[in-house]
């Protein structure tokens, strides 16, 4: 036996409560398949969404976030505060990055710059708060004949092939130095930090609201929830 | 805010008629169908029927098709449910209740007005 | 008519139990079911429409779920205002049908 509601088509509704007929779904409603026996309110776009796509009998709306917001989860089910680049969102609002760390985006959270010695290379550009440190050519692909697109360089007498080499081992070696240190250096400031935190937190801020932007950097300790800040949801 | 005001008691005497009142504000009174249900004490709830006000289309329970008449007043926003020839049967509680259309839920409840059929 | 059951008339549960009523159609009603509290003074109230959609204002520690003829509701968490007589109800067909009601309990 076929169900009488079966033949309703989307934009209606099997209206039970006149005999099966087939109505149209009311304003501020709609169904987007067929045979429903009711019709889903519309979303509504308040406060801090805005409607991208007006609801329709057979579509309901769609929302995205005003300006200085930016959507979150499924159908844009939330909006976030956006925050500068270089800057992420905590529950305090949005922070600078920490040193050694960046965001290039007006949301997300702040990225370890990359470690180019991990690859073998060296750096040649480094990093800010905006942006990732930019790593250049390893020692290996400076040494000769490591580049097929190089034209080979002219002959040179022995004694000054040993000077460029003494020269370039001297520069790796002080450099290699120089990483070890500032690792060493970290490690011990993440340990005293552990073990000291009173001496490196940050004096109360007052803010005026989740919008409001913090110069603190945020340094995050691992536990801390991401996000949170400035979050609507519908 | 939806309301939908009920008078507390009513009290009848058997075989005479009486006249239940469930008056709306909050909302367009003739978007949505008032609905009556009956719960005797300590028992569940039985659906009356339906209107709906702003063509007064009726629906009934085949149970309670020839006890209860379903009626609107739309300049007062009022719907009504008379009982006729009432006996200590009729003794319960019977609540309005609204919902939008199709199969929708009962999504606003009156207070309940409690009938009590007596000599 | 589509008959309502409830198999359970009383359930008894503590403070911050998680506990689920059942309700069982005699019929297919294609997930056109809605749960009511029901308070001592007489107040009744839509939690949960269209087996597991949250009625505005419902708290997030009420759920429904089912399908066919099965449904359930489910309280998370227990707390003092949810102890209460819970109906389930059908929206498919007329007459709009309900179950007997399952009264949750202090233990």
């Known amino acids: 036996l076929q169900d009488p509601c079966s033949n309703c088509p989307a934009g209606t509704f099997c209206d039970n409560n006149r005999n099966q007929i087939c109505s149209p779904c009311p304003p501020n409603s709609f169904s987007s398949a067929g045979g429903q026996r009711t019709c889903d309110i519309c979303r509504q776009c308040k406060g801090v969404f805005r409607t991208r796509k007006e609801c329709s009998s057979t579509s309901n709306a769609e929302c995205d976030c005003t300006p200085g917001f930016h959507c979150l989860g499924a159908g844009c089910s939330m909006c976030e505060q956006d925050c500068k680049q270089g800057q992420e969102l905590t529950k305090k609002g949005c922070k600078d990055c920490c040193f050694g760390t960046f965001n290039d985006q007006k949301r997300g959270i702040c990225r370890p710059w990359t470690n180019c010695s991990l690859d073998g290379k060296s750096v040649l550009v480094n990093g800010t708060k905006e942006r990732d440190v930019v790593c250049g050519p390893s020692p290996a692909d400076l040494s000769p004949g490591a580049s097929s697109v190089t034209p080979p360089a002219p002959a040179r007498e022995p004694g000054h092939s040993l000077q460029v080499l003494t020269l370039f081992l001297a520069l790796t070696s002080a450099l290699l130095l120089a990483l070890i240190f500032i690792t060493l250096l970290f490690s011990v400031l993440k340990w005293i930090r552990k073990k000291f935190p009173h001496i490196f937190k940050q004096p109360f801020k007052k803010t005026t609201g989740a919008a409001q932007e913090e110069d603190a950097c945020s340094c995050r300790c691992p536990q801390e929830e991401e996000g949170g800040g400035g979050g609507y949801e519908l | 805010q939806v309301q939908l005001q009920q008078p507390g008691a009513e009290l009848v005497r058997p075989g005479a008629s009486v006249k239940l009142s469930c008056k709306a504000s909050?909302?367009?009174?003739?978007?949505?169908?008032i609905n009556w249900v009956k719960q005797r004490p300590g028992q569940g709830l039985e659906w009356i029927g339906n209107?709906?006000?702003?063509?007064?289309?009726?629906n009934y329970n085949q149970k309670f098709k020839d006890k209860a008449t379903l009626t609107v007043d739309k300049s007062s926003s009022t719907a009504y449910m008379q009982l006729s020839s009432p006996t200590s049967e009729d003794s319960a509680v019977y609540y309005c209740?609204?919902?939008?259309?199709?199969?929708?839920?009962?999504?606003?409840w009156g207070q309940g007005t409690t009938l009590t059929v007596s000599s | 008519d589509i008959q309502m059951t409830q198999s359970t008339s009383s359930l008894s549960a503590s403070l911050g139990d998680r506990v689920t009523i059942s309700c069982r159609a005699s019929?297919?009603?294609?997930?056109?079911l809605n749960w009511y509290q029901q308070k001592p003074d007489g107040t009744v109230k839509l939690l949960i429409y269209?087996?597991?959609r949250l009625h505005s204002g419902v708290p997030s520690r009420f759920s429904g779920s089912g399908s066919g003829t099965d449904y359930s509701l489910t309280i998370s968490n227990l707390e003092q205002e949810d102890f209460a007589t819970y109906f389930c109800?059908?929206?498919?067909?007329?007459?709009?049908?309900f179950g007997g009601g399952t009264k949750l309990e202090i233990k």
């Open positions: 209740t609204r919902f939008h259309y199709g199969s929708s839920p009962f999504d606003n």
């Open positions: 909050g909302y367009i009174f003739t978007s949505y169908w």
């Open positions: 209107i709906y006000p702003s063509d007064s289309y009726t």
């Open positions: 019929q297919d009603i294609s997930h056109y």
């Open positions: 269209y087996t597991s």
């Open positions: 109800q059908q929206g498919h067909t007329l007459p709009r049908t």
